[in-house]
Amino acid sequence: FPMFKRGRCLCIGPGVKAVKVADIEKASIMYPSNNCDKIEVIITLKENKGQRCLNPKSKQARLIIKKVERKNF
């Protein structure tokens, strides 16, 4: 990260509760590690609108985590 040094986690604060499904290009899940002791759900928005962290406790995040885990395992 050229400007901000990485802290323990990638997200700042609790994250958004929900993102419009139509705006989601990609969802990435970062599981707890030595760098960050909590799960983080990072949404890449369509149309070059950047990224947002989804609150991992939100209903939408739980659904995304479940979906990704089902796909991977």
């Epitope: 604060g13 609790p14 509760k17």
Partner: nanobody, 129 residues
């Protein structure tokens, strides 16, 4: 209605100090990260410093580390940016913003999003040499 009101900008000589304040209202302080951003003429808006109200984490741009300090008074819902050892290159309009879901790595090329971010009107900081 959400409001963020900045104050404390002005003209200062290089090496001097300023303290910016951002008074917020209309939202739950702990649900948001509060950040200071700046925009110099002809340049993109860039992240300067961010405070996560929920856990007290702070983040600083390399260019201001060791010179700027972000803090808050939660009782007053106000965030401060203490700026010391100011340089001419710190000259810019400084904006306070409240946002949800900010990703640290994207703060250099920050894209505001109406649904998740609230912005103040900005305060001019001019550092003369």
């Amino acid at each position: 209605e959400v409001q963020l009101v900045e104050s404390g900008g002005g003209l200062v000589q290089a090496g001097g100090s300023l303290r910016l304040s951002c008074a917020t209202s209309g939202f739950t302080f702990d649900d948001y990260a509060i950040g200071w951003f700046r925009q110099a003429p002809g340049k993109e808006r860039e992240g300067v410093s961010i405070l996560s109200s929920s856990d007290g984490s702070t983040y600083y741009a390399d260019s201001v580390k060791g010179r700027f300090t972000i803090s808050s008074d939660n009782a007053k819902n106000t965030v401060y940016l203490q700026m010391n050892s100011l340089k001419p290159e710190d000259t810019a309009v400084y904006y306070c913003a409240a946002g949800q879901g900010w990703v640290i790595a994207t703060m250099t090329s920050f894209r505001a999003h109406r649904e998740y971010d609230y912005w103040g009107q900005g305060t001019q900081v001019t550092v003369s040499s």
